[in-house]
């Protein structure tokens, strides 16, 4: 069966300066390929985190994505700012040249509250 990307939260609210977790789990690790988090959709979407060797300031993975059986691709955003508001999508790709997007989560909207 086709892999599903599940984002259970429709929205989260976080105070500026605090941290928040955006949950994402997969039903399967197949087909082989990366998982990436984006804010927004379409051509203008912004890459927030990729479960690779790249470094993203203020964004970390919640569980160890290198473990072979791990299906949790949740991320933590620290020191949230008003500019972090928006809808975040967890996206599964199939490895290739280039990688192909095959499934996206339903999105989680982040609301940033004034401190």
């Amino acid at each position: 069966t086709e892999v599903k990307v599940i984002q259970p939260e429709k929205s989260v609210s976080v105070a500026a300066g605090d941290s928040t977790v955006l949950n994402c789990t997969l039903t399967s690790l197949l087909p082989v390929g990366p998982i990436r988090w984006y804010r927004g959709v379409g051509q203008s979407r912004q890459l927030i985190y990729s479960f690779t060797t790249e470094h993203f300031p203020r964004v970390t993975n919640v569980s160890d994505a290198t473990k072979r059986s791990n299906l949790d691709f949740s991320i933590r955003i620290s020191n949230v700012t008003p500019e972090d508001a928006g809808t975040y999508y967890c996206v599964k790709f199939q490895r290739g040249s280039p990688d192909t997007e095959i499934q996206s989560g339903g999105g989680t909207e982040v609301y940033v509250l004034a401190k």
Partner: antibody, heavy 119, light 108 residues
């Protein structure tokens, strides 16, 4: 106080159409996703359809896909369910249910309206 | 589609007794599970969400537990108004949202 009041139910022949309404009050209607959930006589709850606050995102149960249409008018604080090609198995009490703002469980329910499909 | 199986179908107990209702999911739903109470001729009412958090106004004799695929709703001491049908619902996966088949708690 949140209130959801369904209307439009009744007896209808198989193959005919019916439109249900749900009038909402006591909350900012346009900010919440709302659903239709039905319950056949003596049976359990069955989710039917969901529409997001803006009306942009819509889902249907396989059992009604292609026959039922969910819509909303945020200016009137009203949810609708257009039911076409009705079948005997669509006989049920239809509830409108307001989702929690963060998760897809149901904080508030209407009292329900009975739809009977019979010749 | 995630399937929820509730057991038993009917529970016959006396007022003051403890009721234990079970809900099993066909795959993990983590703690994204809610419980509802429905009395005859009435709409369902939210009791528990997040597997163990009581909804507003729900008495503390109602408690929920579990995670993954096994969940329990416990009513510590049944009151006359607790005799009803109880449903579980998962909201982990995006629609279709699914309910269990229900457990009827009746007076013995």
């Amino acid at each position: 106080e949140v209130q959801l009041v369904e209307s439009g139910g009744g007896v209808v022949q198989p193959g005919r159409s019916l439109r249900l309404s749900c009038a909402a009050s006591g909350f900012t209607f346009s900010s919440y996703d709302v659903n239709w959930v039905r319950q056949a006589p003596g049976k359990g709850l069955e989710w039917v359809s969901l529409i997001s606050g803006s009306g942009e995102i819509i889902y249907y149960a396989d059992s009604v896909k292609g026959r039922f249409t969910i819509s909303r008018d945020n200016s009137k604080n009203t949810l609708y369910l257009q039911m076409n090609s009705l079948r005997a198995e669509d006989t049920a009490v239809y509830y409108c249910a307001k989702e929690n703002n963060r998760y897809r469980f149901f904080d508030d329910w209407g009292q329900g309206t009975l739809v009977t499909v019979s010749s | 589609e995630i399937v929820l199986t509730q057991s038993p179908g009917t529970l016959s107990l006396s007022p003051g007794e403890r009721a234990t209702l079970s809900c099993r999911a066909s795959q993990s739903v983590y703690t994204y599970l809610a419980w509802y109470q429905q009395k005859p001729g009435q709409a369902p009412r939210l009791l528990i969400y997040g597997a163990s958090s009581r909804a507003t106004g729900i008495p503390d004799r109602f408690s929920g537990s579990g995670s993954g695929t096994e969940f329990t709703l416990t009513i510590s001491s049944l009151q006359s108004e607790d005799f009803a049908v109880y449903y579980c619902q998962q909201y982990y996966d995006r629609p279709p949202l699914t309910f269990g088949g229900g457990t009827k708690v009746e007076i013995k």
